[in-house]
Structure formats: structure tokens, C-alpha cells
């Protein structure tokens, strides 16, 4: 039995997958910040997790996915205010009793040190210094991401 949050996450991810393929993104759009091969958008307003998820989708992006501790630290370095929390694309899957990224993969327990409980209706937020489990209904800011298309150098044969 999937929770409403899980259903929302799956529905949005599926609808994103169904959309026609768009040309690769070479530069970050206005107001987005580049972090390595990603563009990040830090919201100014606050929303519960599922609205944040949906908002990123309307921007042809997703809630932030963090690959490892290194990426977490670099992302946290972009957060200017100490006390502010941002939703990322990770929530607790009741059916699998584990933290699950919105792309369907599970959290590697070594990647993030989460403060708080792993339980139903829990979603993950990050601050400048920490990673927290919060009720998904909590209204906080959020981070959307777009993947940049790597520019491969063309190799021309000798003329």
C-alpha cells in the first residue's frame, strides 16, 4: 500500500518520463545556480513537500537528488542563511520501510546522516549544516535541479 506522498512522487516522475525528449541543457537558465553538472533553483517561498515536488515538475526539473556526501557539502555551501531548511527529493517509503529518492533508488546509508525519525510521512530537508527528517506537510523552501548536458569535445580526423 503506497502512501499519498509516494503516489504523488511516482505520478510526477512517470509524467516527466512520458514527456517528449527535450534538447540538452548547456547553460543554466536565469535565476538558476550552476553546481558542477547541475543547475539548482532555491525557492524563496515555502510549501509542503508534495507541492514542492510538483512545482519542480512544472519547471521541467526535479526536487534535488544528492549523489554523495561531497555533493551534499557543495550544495550546503550555496545556502546563505543558517536556519533555513530546503526540501530535497527524498522521502520515507512506508511500503519498503526505507528512504527512497524520487528517481526510485534507495538511500545509501553512508551518504547522509539524517537527524530525526524514519517513519511514515517523513521527508528530507537540508540546511547549511545538517540533514533533517521532517513531516512532509511542513512548509519550508525547496531546491529544484536540472541536469546540464556535458559538452563533449568533437574529435576531427586529420585533414
Amino acid at each position: 500500500q503506497k502512501s499519498s506522498i509516494e503516489k504523488c512522487s511516482v505520478d510526477i516522475q512517470q509524467s516527466r518520463n512520458k514527456t517528449t525528449e527535450r534538447p540538452g541543457l548547456l547553460n543554466c537558465p536565469i535565476y538558476w545556480q550552476q553546481l558542477r553538472e547541475k543547475c539548482l533553483l532555491f525557492s524563496h517561498t515555502v510549501n509542503p513537500w508534495n507541492n514542492s515536488l510538483a512545482d519542480c515538475s512544472t519547471k521541467e526539473s526535479s526536487l534535488l537528488l544528492i549523489r554523495d556526501k561531497d555533493e551534499l557539502i557543495h550544495t550546503q555551501n550555496l545556502i546563505r542563511d543558517k536556519a533555513i531548511l530546503f526540501w530535497i527529493g527524498l522521502n520515507f517509503s512506508l511500503s519498503e520501510k526505507n528512504w527512497k529518492w524520487i528517481n526510485g533508488s534507495f538511500l545509501n546509508s553512508n551518504d547522509l546522516e539524517i537527524r530525526g525519525d524514519a517513519k511514515e510521512n517523513s521527508c528530507i530537508s537540508i540546511s547549511q549544516t545538517s540533514v533533517y527528517s521532517e513531516y512532509c506537510s511542513t512548509e519550508i523552501r525547496w531546491i529544484c535541479q536540472k541536469e546540464l548536458t556535458p559538452v563533449r569535445n568533437k574529435v576531427y580526423p586529420d585533414s
Partner: antibody
């Protein structure tokens, strides 16, 4: 280039509902938030509220009980309804793009609304 | 009465610098780095000049700069030009998705 155009009646009777629509051209409405701001003659600006294209709304607390906003992404339009208007609601009403929820980078030219019987 | 306090008027001669202040509280200006400034010429829509305290949109001359200290934000116009004569409004995010404006400052180029 993004352009916004307000439309609606220029005259509204007291106690009736003011209705305005903003049409967005030169870009998709979907990727941003959209706000309404008003300016009484010779006075300053007042933020009325914003709408996200997912349908979520945020309203100025002082106007919240009278304001309704909606969005139609298929028409690239968003709308404002302000009920129970009085002479104090007479103003130029602007629609604006609200990229992150704290500032406005594109504005309509404004729509003058007079409240009179 | 506006939530943010601005001086009603400011003036300067061409080439000079003028600073317009915008004073709020710890619940708006002091609490967030989300202050913006707008220029409005008579009969026209406002134009964004500064956002997020000090960022300038493309097309805005670098003569316009923004800063913040505590609960007060400032807009500085250096090298004043005749076309800078206009009304200037500050705005700030004010928590729980609210937003407030200042009362406006009429800038006169002498």
C-alpha cells in the same frame, strides 16, 4: 521577450466583484509564479497575492478574505477576483511575473479600475 | 501606511551619488536576503532594478547598486543622470509567503 497584458472592466460598482485577467505571451506560464500588485492613484504599491501554476496560492493577509486567484495554463492566463469592493480598491492593477516568490521581473502595463455606482 | 519605511524624497545633481534607505524589521528586511528595488516613471509600470539585496538584472546599469545592514536596505544610484528621475520602491519577502513594499521615494535630479 515575455509580455503581460491585463484585461477586464475598468468600472466596478461598490460591493461587486472586480475581475481581471492577465495574458502572458512570449513564454510559457508554467515555469514561474505570477502575482497581482495594485497602486492607488498617487500612492505606493501593494502586493495582492501570487499563484503557482500547480494551483497553490499565497495572498496578502490584509486582502485574503476577498481575493481569489486562478490559472489556466492552456490559455497562458491567470486571473484575479476581488469581492465586495469599495472606493479604497480603486487603483491601477498590475500583473507580474514572480520568478522565485520575492520579486517581479516582468510587469503588465497596468489596468485602471474605478469603483463607482 | 506601508510596511517598509522610505524617505518621501531624495535629490542630487547630475554625476553625484544618491542613497535611498528602506527600513523594515527583523520579520522582513532583516530576516531575509530577499529585498528588491523598482524604478517607476510617471504613467509607467515599475521596472526591477535590484533583487536579492544586491543582484542586478541584465540591462540595468551598474550605476545602481543595493546593500543591506540589519533591518535597513539601501539603493545607491551613482553618476546620477536625468533619466534616473523617478519613483523608487523597495520590497521585501516578509515570511510565510508574504511580501511587503515601501511607500516609495521620489528621486529628483537637480
Amino acid at each position: 521577450q515575455v509580455q503581460l497584458q491585463e484585461s477586464g472592466p475598468g468600472l466596478v460598482k461598490p460591493s461587486e466583484t472586480l475581475s481581471l485577467t492577465c495574458t502572458v505571451s512570449g513564454g510559457s506560464i508554467s515555469s514561474y509564479y505570477w502575482s497581482w500588485i495594485r497602486q492607488p492613484a498617487g500612492k505606493g504599491l501593494e502586493w495582492i497575492g501570487r499563484i503557482y501554476t500547480i494551483g497553490t496560492t499565497n495572498y496578502n493577509p490584509s486582502l485574503k478574505s476577498r481575493v481569489t486567484m486562478s490559472v489556466d495554463t492552456s490559455k497562458n492566463q491567470f486571473s484575479l477576483k476581488l469581492s465586495s469592493v469599495t472606493a479604497a480598491d480603486a487603483a491601477v492593477y498590475y500583473c507580474a511575473r514572480d520568478p522565485l516568490g520575492s520579486f517581479f521581473d516582468y510587469w503588465g502595463q497596468g489596468s485602471l479600475v474605478t469603483v463607482s455606482s | 501606511q506601508s510596511a517598509l519605511t522610505q524617505p518621501p524624497s531624495a535629490s542630487g545633481s547630475p554625476g553625484q551619488s544618491v542613497t535611498i534607505s528602506c527600513t523594515g524589521t527583523s520579520s522582513d528586511v532583516g530576516g531575509y536576503n530577499y529585498v528588491s528595488w523598482y524604478q517607476q516613471h510617471p504613467g509607467k509600470a515599475p521596472k526591477l532594478m535590484i533583487y536579492e539585496v544586491s543582484k542586478r538584472p541584465s540591462g540595468v546599469p551598474d550605476r545602481f547598486s543595493g546593500s543591506k545592514s540589519g533591518n535597513t536596505a539601501s539603493l545607491t544610484v551613482s553618476g546620477l543622470q536625468a533619466e534616473d528621475e523617478a519613483d523608487y520602491y523597495c520590497s521585501s519577502y516578509a515570511g510565510i509567503n508574504n511580501l511587503v513594499f515601501g511607500g516609495g521615494t521620489k528621486l529628483t535630479v537637480l
